[in-house]
C-alpha cells in the first residue's frame, strides 16, 4: 500500500523524497518516474539527477527543495486529473541491491467550485492546508508519535540515520512501503 498524497486540479502537487548525502555535495543519482518502481531504474522517467545536477526533466516536473542536501521531493505544476497515479522515487545508491525505492500515490481531486463570497471568510477555511506544502522536516523528527501516523517524509528522512536501529525496523514494517533496494 503506497502512501497517499492529494492535490486539487490546477494546484501544484508535492511528493516528498529525501536521502542523506555522505557529505555536502556528495550526491547520489535519483530518478522519478510515473508508475511503481520497477526492478531497475524508473519507468516513464519524468526527472533525473546525477552526482552533480538535475540532468533530465520534463515540463511541469521540478525539484523545489535543495537537492544538493538530499531533498529530492518532486513538485508537479498545475496538476490535472491525468497526473493521478503512483510515482516512484528511486535513490540509486552505488552497488547492487542497494537502491532505496519509494512508491507514492498521488490522488488528484477536481477543483472545488465555490460561489463568490458574500462576506469575509476565515482564511484557513478558504485556504485549507494541502499536502502540496512542505510536510514535517528533519527538525521535527524527534516528535515521532505513534508509528502508524508517521508520514513518508519523516520515514525517508530518517531511513539512513536509523538504518540499524530497532526503530528503523519498526518504521519499515509500519506499512509505509519503504523499500531498501
Amino acid at each position: 500500500s503506497e502512501v497517499e498524497y492529494r492535490a486539487e486540479v490546477g494546484q501544484n502537487a508535492y511528493l516528498p523524497c529525501f536521502y542523506t548525502p555522505a557529505a555536502p555535495g556528495n550526491l547520489v543519482p535519483v530518478c522519478w518516474g510515473k508508475g511503481a518502481c520497477p526492478v531497475f531504474e524508473c519507468g516513464n522517467v519524468v526527472l533525473r539527477t546525477d552526482e552533480r545536477d538535475v540532468n533530465y526533466w520534463t515540463s511541469r516536473y521540478w525539484l523545489n527543495g535543495d537537492f544538493r542536501k538530499g531533498d529530492v521531493s518532486l513538485t508537479i505544476e498545475n496538476v490535472t486529473l491525468a497526473d493521478s497515479g503512483i510515482y516512484c522515487c528511486r535513490i540509486q545508491i552505488p552497488g547492487i541491491m542497494n537502491d532505496e525505492k519509494f512508491n507514492l500515490k498521488l490522488v488528484i481531486k477536481p477543483a472545488k467550485v465555490t460561489p463568490a463570497p458574500t462576506r469575509q471568510r476565515d482564511f484557513t477555511a478558504a485556504f485549507p492546508r494541502m499536502l502540496t506544502t512542505r510536510g514535517h522536516g528533519p527538525a521535527e523528527t524527534q516528535t515521532l508519535g505513534s508509528l502508524p501516523d508517521i508520514n513518508l517524509t519523516q520515514i525517508s528522512t530518517l531511513a539512513n540515520e536509523l538504518r540499524d536501529s530497532r526503530l528503523a525496523n519498526d518504521l519499515r514494517d509500519s506499512g509505509a512501503t519503504i523499500r531498501i533496494g
Epitope: T20, A22, G70, I93, P94, G95, N98, D173, R179
Partner: antibody, heavy 124, light 106 residues
Amino acid sequence: EVQLVQSGAEVKKPGESLKISCKGSGYSFTSYWMQWVRQMPGKGLEWMGAIYPGDGDIRYTQNFKGQVTISADKSISTAYLQWSSLKASDTAMYYCARWEKSTTVVQRNYFDYWGQGTTVTVSS
Amino acid sequence: DIQMTQSPSSLSASVGDRVTITCKASENVGTFVSWYQQKPGKAPKLLIYGASNRYTGVPSRFSGSGSGTDFTLTISSLQPEDFATYYCGQSYSYPTFGQGTKLEIK
C-alpha cells in the same frame, strides 16, 4: 541475536520436486535481502539469487534463472528455494545468507549472517 | 558476470607466518569486495568488507586492501584457527566469488 535456521538434509531422486527453507529471527525479516548460495562438493561459492521479503522483489543470476524458484513468507519470516524437477547436478550444499546493503552514507554490500546450510543429494 | 580470479588456489604456511592472498576482478568493482573464511562443514564467515574494513569481531591480524580490479587479503601472523579456505567476492554487480584459496599447515 540474528539467526538463520535452514531445513534439514534432503535425499531425492532425479525428476522429483523439492522446497528447502530458511527461517530468519532476531531482526526485521522484511527489511533485508535474503540470498541463496550454492556450493557443490569440493567447489567454491556460487550466488544463485535473492528475495527482498518486504515487497517480494526477486533477482536471479543467469545460470539459475528458470532452474529454481525463490520465494518468501513474511508472516513466518521464512525464505524458500525450490526445484520442480531435480537433476543429479543439483547435488550440493545450499546456504541462505542475509545481505547487508549500502546506504548513501556507508558502503556495505556483504553477506553478514549465514544459515548452517542444507545438503541436497540427488541420486537414482 | 564479473569474474573474480583468486590466487594462489592453495597455500602451505606455518603458525606465525605472514600470508597474502590476491584477487583480481575482470572489471572495475570500486571497493565492493568482501573476504570470507570457510572451515570444512561450516558456513562461510565474513572477515572484510568494502575491500579494507574489518567486520565486527574479526581479529586485527586480518586486513584487506585494494580498489578497482586488484585486491589482497593479508594475515599478519597466522594462528592455528586460521587454517581454512578463503574466498573473495564482489558485490558491485550481482555477487560473484573467487574460486577459493585453501590455506594449509606446512
